[in-house]
């Protein structure tokens, strides 16, 4: 007889998803010498030990200290960039400065990016029907729980002048439910973070406003002054442009605007 | 930190030159336009010239255009302003900012700018 089993409203683990974690923590710490003292079939073992057999609308981010411990990173606390809804410019920017790190730049951030995973309560199953949508079933479900923990202590570790990369496109510039509003932004030190930079991405080509004067751009000045951080405004018109002009400054066409 | 700070200026003879310098130290990325501003007793900050980020495209105001010339160095994290036949209409305290984007669009205007450096005074006698 088949088990019952619970159906969520999003998508189930990604396929091969212990592999592809594995996979990815022995490609990272080859890559980065300061980091190959992991072990990463502890850091699997304690990834999964933070949601196997547990359920999946019930997790803590306790339940991910013991891989907290073992990804600890240290990156330059004043290189930090951060974003919010514009993920693939954000990370295509690192790769060209890189000198500069978003969260998926670090073990942590790259062993999670972009995949699902959930198990079920009392069995060592991987679920890969369906793990819980952070709407319509639960917040506190491993994959919600693990990005908040990350992006706390991703916020919490910045210095200086922080940068965070904002889509003009959308309606809300800034969003406050977003990771970024809701969770980075409020766990910058104002001891150590005395600047956070927006750089607010256009999307149209003949986009010439200024969105810095966006409402919710003024909302996040609020905010972000409230906390006794400076905030400063960037308007990005140009992106594809911007980033080829980044990497080759040298180039014919990055002698005009941007 | 960001900070801007401008130097350079100083007491010199109608007809002379000198060299203002800003440092934009505390920058991981320096891809943004940069500004020289003046300011008279009792007046706005005027527009004096802008350049864009990578320092291809300047700007100057019709007051001290064929005089003064703007450049930059990113590596050096350092902005000029080279002003050469100087009045004593240009006696003023100037300001080095930088902008709200990467090219020139509304570098004639303060609100286009978002980080300002502590200015410098130049005074030029006749």
């Known amino acids: 007889v088949p088990r019952w089993r619970q159906q969520w409203s999003g998508p189930g683990t990604t396929k091969r998803f212990p592999e592809t974690v594995l996979a990815r923590c022995v490609k990272y710490t080859e890559i980065h010498p300061e980091m190959r003292h992991v072990d990463c079939q502890s850091v699997w073992d304690a990834f999964k030990g933070a949601f196997i057999s547990k359920h999946p609308c019930n997790i803590t981010e306790e339940d991910y200290q013991p891989l907290m411990k073992l990804g600890t990173q240290t990156v330059p606390c004043n290189k930090i960039l951060l974003w919010s809804r514009i993920k693939d410019l954000a990370h295509q920017f690192t790769q060209v400065q890189r000198d500069m790190f978003t969260l998926e730049d670090t073990l942590l951030g790259y062993l999670a990016d972009d995949l699902t995973w959930c198990g079920e309560f009392n069995t060592s199953k991987i679920n890969y029907q369906s793990c819980p949508d952070w709407r319509k079933d639960c917040s506190n479900n491993p994959v919600s729980v693990f990005w908040k923990t990350v992006s706390r202590r991703f916020a919490e570790a910045a210095c200086d002048v922080v940068h965070v990369m904002l889509n003009g496109s959308r309606s809300k510039i800034f969003d406050k439910n977003s990771t970024f509003g809701s969770v980075e932004v409020h766990n910058l030190q104002p001891e150590k973070v005395q600047t956070l930079e927006a750089w607010v991405i256009h999307g149209g080509r003949e986009d010439s406003r200024d969105l810095c004067q966006d409402p919710t751009i003024k909302e996040l000045e609020s905010i972000i002054s409230k906390r006794n951080i400076q905030f400063s405004c960037k308007n990005i018109y140009r992106p594809d442009k911007f980033l080829q002009c980044v990497k080759n400054p040298e180039d014919s066409s990055c002698t005009s605007e941007i | 930190d960001v900070q801007l700070q401008a130097s350079g200026g100083g007491l010199v003879q109608a007809g002379g030159s000198l060299r203002l310098s800003c440092e934009f130290s505390?920058?991981?990325?320096?891809?943004?336009?940069m500004g020289w501003f003046r300011q008279f007793p009792g007046k706005e900050r005027e527009f004096v010239a802008a350049?864009?980020?990578?320092?291809?495209?300047?700007d100057y105001s019709d007051s001290v255009k064929g005089r003064f010339t703007i450049s930059r160095d990113n590596v050096k994290s350092t902005m000029y302003l080279v002003m050469n036949s100087l009045k004593p209409e240009d006696t003023a305290v100037y300001y080095c900012?930088?902008?709200?984007?990467?090219?020139?669009?509304?570098?004639?205007?303060?609100?286009?700018?978002?980080?300002w450096g502590r200015g410098t005074q130049v005074t030029v006698s006749s």
């Open positions: 900012a930088e902008a709200r984007s990467a090219e020139l669009g509304s570098s004639r205007k303060i609100q286009g700018y978002d980080q």
């Open positions: 505390g920058r991981t990325f320096s891809g943004f336009a």
């Open positions: 350049i864009n980020w990578s320092g291809s495209s300047v």
